[in-house]
């Protein structure tokens, strides 16, 4: 469930602190409820960038697990189509710390509406 997703995000945050990754990532910091699935997609795609750049097995496995969890949770809600949402490339670029904080925020939004 989403609680496990948050714990994976915390784990990624801890793992990244011991590394020096300067990447900036497309970050949705003000998610509209009608675009939360689209925003989640962008966060997950950007997480793969972190995984690639880190080259770290623990980060790779945790990112993969997080995507598996999110996929299964969202698939159980059926196909959700959203329109009028920003493309990932239109989002503001932020550092990893801010990116992960915003990610936790959107997950909490899913928790509050489930």
């Amino acid at each position: 469930n989403w609680v496990n997703v948050i714990s994976d995000l915390k784990k990624i945050e801890d793992l990244i602190q011991s590394m020096h990754i300067d990447a900036t990532l497309y970050t949705e910091s003000d998610v509209h409820p009608s675009c939360k699935v689209t925003a989640m997609k962008c966060f997950l795609l950007e997480l793969q960038v972190i995984s690639h750049e880190s080259g770290d097995t623990d980060i790779h496995d945790t990112v993969e697990n997080l995507i598996i969890l999110a996929n299964n949770i969202l698939s159980s809600n059926g196909n959700i189509t959203e329109s009028g949402c920003k493309e990932c490339e239109e989002l503001e670029e932020k550092n990893i710390k801010e990116f992960l904080q915003s990610f936790v925020h959107i997950v909490q939004m899913f928790i509050n509406t489930s």
Epitope: V37, M40, K41, L44, L45, Q48, S51, H52, T57, D58, H60, D61, T62, V63, E64, N65, I67, I68, A70, N71, N72, L74, S75, N79
Partner: antibody, heavy 122, light 112 residues
């Protein structure tokens, strides 16, 4: 050439246990997630378990969850499947398979071992 | 769980002729990141399965170009442009977009 050698199969009574092993060679074992897939006699394929590269994350279908445990020893390049509370319907050839990572371009079982037969019968 | 349904279950083909196998999923297998994790595996008699196609249409290394994959959403197809004797066996579609990962029942290809 990637090599996967499954072993440990045999005849076991219902309710019994068995541990399968899969020895990997000719690739960097710790760089790949690994899986077990089974095939009952004359039947189709069924996914049984997957384990992440580092071994922290495991995935199972409901049919084996709580009875089977997948694990790995990266220092020995070996994958395991501990099977407890075995049932007649667990009778199958068990294949180990290397799993390509989603993050490196798509998920798939790109290489398979030769399989080991597990027979559960009294 | 996602149910994968293949048709036909038996496919007699004349050597040199084309063959087509259909695979339908009970729900869309497009994942949250927009990827579709649909593979095709071949199992020759007495052998272990072998990867042919991954992510719907990508041929695995060493797979002859007479094999091709297509489809989207819930409907997928494996095509063999000209069947050869070595193509005899059972073909399985497989989805790993969502846990539990699931195979189709298999399609047995035989020579007429």
């Amino acid at each position: 050439e990637v090599r996967l050698m499954a072993s440990g199969g045999g005849l076991v009574q219902p309710g019994g246990s068995l541990r399968l092993s899969c020895a990997a060679s000719e690739f960097t074992f710790s760089n790949y997630a690994m899986s077990w897939v089974r095939q009952a006699p004359g039947k189709g394929l069924e996914w049984v378990a997957t384990i992440s590269r580092g071994g922290d994350y495991t995935y199972y279908p409901d049919s084996v969850k709580g009875r089977f445990t997948i694990s790995r020893d990266n220092s020995k390049n070996t994958l395991y499947l501990q099977m407890n509370s075995l049932r007649a319907e667990d009778t199958a050839v068990y294949y180990c398979a290397r799993r390509v990572s989603m993050i490196t371009g798509g998920w798939a079982f790109d290489y398979w071992g030769q399989g080991t037969l597990v027979t559960v019968s009294s | 769980d996602v149910v994968m349904t293949q048709s036909p279950l038996s496919l007699p083909v004349t050597l040199g002729q084309p063959a087509s196998i259909s695979c339908r999923s009970s729900q869309s297998i497009v994942d949250i990141t927009g990827n579709t994790y649909l593979e095709w595996y071949q199992q020759r008699p007495g052998q272990s399965p072998r990867l042919l196609i991954y992510k719907v249409f990508n041929r695995f290394s060493g797979v002859p170009d007479r094999f091709s994959g297509s489809g989207s959403g819930t409907d997928f197809t494996l095509k063999i442009s000209r069947v050869e004797a070595e193509d005899v066996g059972v073909y399985y579609c497989f989805q790993d977009s969502f846990v539990p990962y699931t195979f189709g029942q298999g399609t047995k290809l035989e020579i007429k």
